[in-house]
């Protein structure tokens, strides 16, 4: 059973390339259409003409590109996380909204509440949910900073979720934080706003308790331009999740093999 | 190309598991002696006879056992990755030294200093290190707390590298940080004294930034115990690294395929 | 998961991730690793059917992608998915290492 | 590592990280998918040698164990070890979707 | 796929009583896995569930009652007082909202003195 | 809280008749509310989830219907077999609550 170094892929052996290559490109037609859970390509007959709508390009931009913080490993993959996600997003809730008001003068943060009526909107039902991730777009910033994110726990606790080293940039940059463990309790919760805060990372000895981060959306000087691309940017949930008709399909015909 | 259900490990195929087995022990042999880089096995005239030392069982021990913080994921094995890693420790500085006079009265963190020398010991090359992890025994508690660890960066300033919530517990618990980058570092730097800090998170508003945990071998009231249990359960560095002959053999004999 | 708690306790003939345990004497002759005195080595093994589809049963052959042939390979093989490291206790002459050898424990296979 | 960068730009016969561009027009046949129009899904080829030793050299073989046989196993097959997702827009009826599938394109691969 | 409790018998009041439900045929990182009780003659009542991350939740008369947690194939109730008021049939649930869930045979608790 | 209430506690009717059961929340739930039968002796069985989707095996005499705070199970042709208690359960919070089922219905064929 011992294979020889001269098993090579020689040029006699151009066709098996050929062939394999056929096989896989078939292979990934079957690939597809399983984790779609679709029998066969669908149907093209209602689709409106013309280009996609902009928010529906921008929300594929979003999931494609890759943001300082969202980890590009390997995904293990259990049985669930096979098939295809519905990819959504939820924006924060907006600035002028009152619940902002207590939160204006606080130089060490900044804070984004999210409707979780909004959120479960996409997904009904908390276990269909597979990834969340907050987004923020980060102005440019010549300051390095090492920033903190906490969760609203109860009336005037908030819970540590993470940090980060945010180096200087000559160009706005986009953020992203796991948040799926939080979402998913919102979800368990009920209806209500819930949500984020954004700080500095303040350690015990030091003076300097500023956040000099400017994020799109929040940060005071720009409140004024709420243009349609600024709002496009204001802080989001990505959100992951099976599509219900999906989980029950996938439910209903699952089998021992 | 199809392969059908019924391809299965049927009963007139038992004969192939036997003969799996016994390649798969057979590819362990040339496994274990490839990643020791040996060509046979190792012979055993000067063995001292009677049972292995204490301390090397300790080290084997510690090697063996997951520790809260260890990542247990599969490693990804990049080529220098194959081969085998000889295991070391290296204890903190003893806490009677001059060294911790000034960090004594600090309620906030607790100080552990390592001597570069006694680290290049056991690395003598900064490339051949693999992994450095700082192992702390956290003592039986009843509080949470949220700590964080630093590494002394320059005169008086402190570089953030980590961060644990630390649940109640009713057993003493070992702490594992992965500390390689800061130690290879160390190694670069040439000798000296070298420290980390472990410290409360203090956030932006927090009044009680005291630290609640107690670390064997550092927390004030079992300074009296030095006993040789006990001084093997001070903080230490786990090191995992290319033993020297190995690496200059690794290197003599690499050849791109 | 096709790991060490699903298939050891199953008798699935897929693929699948099959006890080994590796006695160093008895197995390999060896008395020259003092500990441990073997380990739980495992090994993938079974077929990755339904790779490709035959036109009469195309729904089937997808609904079985997710088990048999995940990442769409043109001939998908049973291999480890999780391994885990194994250190061991060794004399160099008068001098005991202590040594970790990494991905030497399979705890579960998958079709790739 | 066998990854696109090193497999893409050498020779490599053993084990190695395959081009392979999929356009699902011209490939697939399909029109549903509206982004992307194609994407680099790539494969893994190539023979894991070395894998039994002949006594005659079995110093060689050793050696060549970190690449062709890394996890000793019984017969050791080329296959990824990094994958990547990929997002698609297709339409369900008149909505537009935006799906991620998971492990979809290889970025490496090893002998395992 | 299948569940199975295990651990009900006889318990004098005050001793801490674990149950165990065993799992198998599925990953319970895609599921909600809940407790629920029914005292004889009575009611269904939900006492809490561990979630596809490991959070708890608990129903708030259960809370510091009850103890819920999980392993790869394990789910585990453990009871840290239990009263003769617990005495009931125990009931372990595997839940998704979105499909039909699965439920366990039950295994008896009884607590008297 | 989520509280459900059910209604009516017991009901008697004849076979081959129709059984309506009420369950009603006390905040929205939206359509998370599942149905379940339980036989004396047995564990529940489900019938309905998502408040209208049948469970796979459930005849289709049982239905259900409602969202937001009040739902209802219907149970058409009513045979003997059908003998048994009702619960509710809704699966829209976990947070903060005394039950997530309904108090039960327990329906005797005359």
């Known amino acids: 059973d011992y294979k020889d170094d001269d098993d090579k892929l020689s040029t006699s052996k151009t066709i098996d390339m050929e062939l394999v290559k056929r096989k896989r490109i078939e292979a990934i037609r079957g690939q597809i259409l399983s984790k779609l859970r679709l029998a066969s390509p669908p149907s093209q007959g209602e689709v409106p003409p013309g280009p996609l709508p902009e928010a529906v390009l921008a929300l594929y931009n979003s999931t494609r590109d890759r943001v300082a913080g969202e980890s590009a490993d390997p995904e293990p993959e259990p049985e669930a996380d096979y098939y295809a996600k519905e990819v959504t997003r939820v924006l924060m809730v907006d600035r002028n909204n009152a619940i902002y008001e207590k939160t204006k003068d606080i130089s060490h943060s900044i804070y984004m509440f999210f409707n979780t009526s909004d959120i479960r909107e996409a997904v009904p039902e908390p276990p269909l949910l597979s990834r969340a991730e907050l987004r923020l777009q980060r102005l440019k910033s010549s300051v390095e900073q090492h920033v903190e994110l906490y969760q609203k726990y109860s009336n005037n606790s908030w819970r540590y979720l993470g940090n980060r080293l945010l180096t200087p940039t000559d160009t706005p940059e986009w953020l992203s934080f796991d948040v799926t463990g939080v979402v998913r309790q919102w979800l368990n919760q009920g209806d209500g706003i819930q949500g984020f805060r954004f700080s500095a990372h303040c350690s015990c000895d030091s003076k300097d308790n500023k956040l000099h981060v400017e994020i799109n959306g929040i940060s005071p000087k720009r409140r004024g331009d709420l243009g349609t691309i600024h709002d496009m940017n204001r802080p989001f949930l990505l959100l992951m999740a099976t599509p219900l008709e999906r989980a029950q399909h996938l439910h209903s015909s699952r089998h021992r093999r | 190309d199809y392969k059908d259900d019924d391809d299965k490990l049927s009963t007139s195929k038992t004969i192939d598991m036997e003969l799996v087995k016994r390649k798969r022990i057979e590819a362990i042999r040339g496994q274990i002696l490839s990643k020791l880089r040996l060509a046979s096995p190792p012979s055993q005239g000067e063995v001292p006879p009677g049972p292995l030392p204490e301390a090397v069982l300790a080290l084997y021990n510690s090697t063996r056992d997951r520790v809260a913080g260890e990542s247990a994921d599969p490693e990804p094995e990049p080529e220098a990755d194959y081969y085998a890693k000889e295991v070391t420790r290296v204890l903190m500085v003893d806490r009677n030294n001059a060294i911790y006079e000034k960090t004594k009265d600090i309620s906030h963190s607790i100080y552990m200093f390592f001597n570069t020398s006694d680290i290049r010991e056991a690395v003598p090359e900064p490339p051949l290190l693999s992994r450095a992890e700082l192992r702390l025994q956290r003592l039986k508690s009843s509080v949470e707390q949220h700590v964080e660890l630093y590494q002394k960066y320059s005169n008086n300033s402190w570089r953030y590298l980590g961060n644990r919530l630390l649940t109640p517990t009713d057993t003493p618990e070992w702490l594992s940080f992965d500390v390689t980058g800061v130690v290879r570092q160390w190694l670069n730097q040439g000798d000296g004294i070298q420290g980390f800090r472990f410290s409360a998170h203090c956030s932006c508003d927090s009044k009680d930034n005291k630290l609640h945990v107690e670390i064997n071998g550092i927390s004030p009231k079992r300074r009296g115990d030095l006993g040789t249990i006990h001084d093997m359960n001070r903080p230490f560095l786990l090191l995992m690294a290319t033993p020297l002959e190995r690496a200059q053999h690794l290197h003599s004999s690499r050849h791109r395929r | 998961a096709l790991d060490t708690n699903y298939c050891f306790s199953s008798t699935e003939k897929n693929c699948c991730v099959r006890q080994l345990y590796i006695d160093f004497r008895k197995d390999l002759g060896w008395k020259w690793i003092h500990e441990p005195k073997g380990y739980h080595a495992n090994f993938c093994l079974g077929p990755c059917p339904y790779i490709w589809s035959l036109d009469t049963q195309y729904s089937k052959v997808l609904a079985l992608y997710n088990q048999h042939n995940p990442g769409a390979s043109a001939s998908p093989c049973c291999v480890p998915q999780a391994l885990e490291p194994l250190p061991i206790v060794y004399y160099v002459g008068r001098k005991p290492k202590v040594e970790q050898l990494s991905n030497m424990i399979v705890r579960s296979c998958k079709c790739s | 590592a066998l990854d696109t960068n090193y497999c893409f730009s050498s020779t490599e016969k053993n084990c190695c990280v395959r081009q392979l561009y999929i356009d699902f027009r011209k490939d697939l046949g399909w029109k549903w998918i509206h982004e992307p129009k194609g994407y680099h899904a790539n494969f893994c080829l190539g023979p894991c040698p070395y894998i039994w030793s002949l006594d005659t050299q079995y110093s060689k073989v050793l050696a060549l164990y970190n690449q062709h046989n890394p996890g000793a196993s019984a017969s050791p097959c080329c296959v990824p070890q990094a994958l990547e997702p990929l997002p698609i827009v297709y339409y369900v009826g008149r909505k537009p979707k935006v799906e991620q599938l998971s492990n979809m394109i290889v970025r490496s691969c090893k002998c395992s | 796929q299948s569940l199975e409790e295990s651990g009900g018998r006889l318990v004098t009041p005050g001793t801490p009583l674990t149950l165990t439900c065993t799992t198998s045929?599925?990953?319970?990182?895609?599921?909600?896995m809940n407790w629920v009780r029914q005292a004889p003659g009575k009611g269904l009542e939900w006492i809490g569930l561990?979630?596809?991350?490991?959070t708890t939740y608990y129903a708030n008369w259960a809370k510091g009652r009850f103890t819920v947690s999980k392993t790869s194939t394990t789910v585990d109730l453990k009871m840290t007082s239990p009263t003769t008021e617990d005495t009931a049939t125990y009931f372990c649930?595997?839940?998704?909202?979105?499909?039909?869930?699965?439920w366990g045979p039950g295994t008896l608790v009884t607590v008297s003195s | 809280a989520y509280d459900m209430t059910q209604t009516p506690a017991s009901v008697e009717v004849a076979v081959g008749g129709t059984v309506t059961i009420k369950c009603q929340a006390s905040?929205?739930?939206?359509?998370?509310l599942a149905w379940y039968q339980q036989k004396p002796g047995q564990p529940p069985k489900q019938l309905i989830y998502?408040?209208?989707t049948l469970a796979s095996g459930v005849s289709s005499r049982f239905k259900g219907s409602g969202s937001g705070t009040q739902f209802t199970l219907t149970i058409s042709g009513v045979e003997c077999a059908d003998a048994a208690t009702y619960y509710c359960q809704q699966t829209y919070s976990w947070s903060g609550l005394d039950n997530v089922f309904g108090g039960g219905t327990k329906v005797e064929i005359k």
């Open positions: 905040q929205s739930i939206s359509s998370s």
């Open positions: 561990t979630d596809n991350d490991g």
């Open positions: 649930v595997r839940d998704a909202g979105y499909s039909r869930n699965l």
């Open positions: 045929g599925f990953s319970l990182n895609n599921y909600y």
């Open positions: 998502r408040a209208s």
